[in-house]
Amino acid sequence: VPRWRQQWSGPGTTKRFPETVLARCVKYTEIHPEMRHVDCQSVWDAFKGAFISKHPCNITEEDYQPLMKLGTQTVPCNKILLWSRIKDLAHQFTQVQRDMFTLEDTLLGYLADDLTWCGEFNTSKINYQSCPDWRKDCSNNPVSVFWKTVSRRFAEAACDVVHVMLNGSRSKIFDKNSTFGSVEVHNLQPEKVQTLEAWVIHGGREDSRDLCQDPTIKELESIISKRNIQFSCKNIYRPDKFLQCVKNPEDSSCTSEI
């Protein structure tokens, strides 16, 4: 007799989820010597323990603490790049500027990037059919709680000048409901962080507007200033040229506005 299974509104667990997490862990620890001590089987066990046999709308940050402990990693606090709704360019940037880091350049971010997962209450099964959607079902689901937890810790670790890449093509360049707007902004530590610098990435070839004057950027500036952190903003009119100039700042074409 088939067992009744809760139908959620979101896509189910990514296929081959356990194998993917384990393989990513092995790959990451091979590439990053400072994480060679990590036992990937223990990491997977801790990851699994955070959501297996638990109701997927009842997950807490506490559930992820064993995983957080195993994945503890020291990233240079002054070389952190946050991003919102522009992940691909942020990752292209840290591939070029190898000494700067997005969350997905850390072990835990790398493990979970682009994956979905959830379990079921009282069974050890992984649900490959459906998982809760943040809006339609519940916010305390395994994926959302994971990203909230690691994002908070990442922001708390930041110091000096923190950079954030924002998508200038969106109607809300700064969105209070994004992970950046709802978690990271509020967890930067004013006693450690002097400046938050926003890079607003332009989409259109002929777009010469100053998007740093956008009302949502002004809202971000207000939130940051109230937290006693300086705010600065830079338009990146030509993201392709920007990446080129990051790669080679002495290039003659980099003497004009990027």
Epitope: K79, M100, V161, T195, S232, K234, C245, P249, E250
Partner: nanobody
Framework: EVQLLESGGGLVQAGASLRLSCAAS????????MGWFCQAPGKGREFVAG???????LYADSVKGRFTISRDNAKNMVYLQMNSLAPEDTAVYFC?????????????????WGQGTQVTVSS
């Protein structure tokens, strides 16, 4: 050949101001992070202030609110405005440039250095 040349140092009374200048030549520093460091007798080089390619600034806690870093990309110049100087600010001040765009406190991460300019603050 890349050269950084500092000027503007001198002997001043406590409470006075000085403006240090750094002239860069040999390449464009528009997209480089620039920094000021100081070295007191018998000590290592310490970060004072820095500015990234975009203009965002970073200061040592000891100078925050007293010193201001600025740059003029058209002239390839970097400045350090020093106000409310105290005897503890006495040191040789060095201008430094990175071949990267982002400011950092670590002297090891700067690629080019000037010869330094002496600042002496008497009480």
């Amino acid at each position: 050949e890349v050269q950084l040349l500092e000027s503007g140092g001198g002997l001043v009374q406590a409470g006075a101001s000085l403006r240090l200048s750094c002239a860069a030549s040999g390449r464009t520093f528009r997209n480089s992070a620039m920094g000021w460091f100081c070295q007191a007798p018998g000590k290592g080089r310490e970060f004072v202030a820095g500015m990234s390619w975009s203009g965002s600034t970073l200061y040592a806690d000891s100078v925050k609110g007293r010193f201001t870093i600025s740059r003029d990309n058209a002239k390839n110049m970097v400045y350090l405005q020093m106000n409310s100087l105290a005897p503890e600010d006495t040191a040789v001040y060095f201008c430094a440039a990175r071949s990267r765009m982002f400011v950092t406190r670590s002297p090891d991460e700067y690629d080019y250095w000037g010869q330094g300019t002496q600042v002496t603050v008497s009480s």
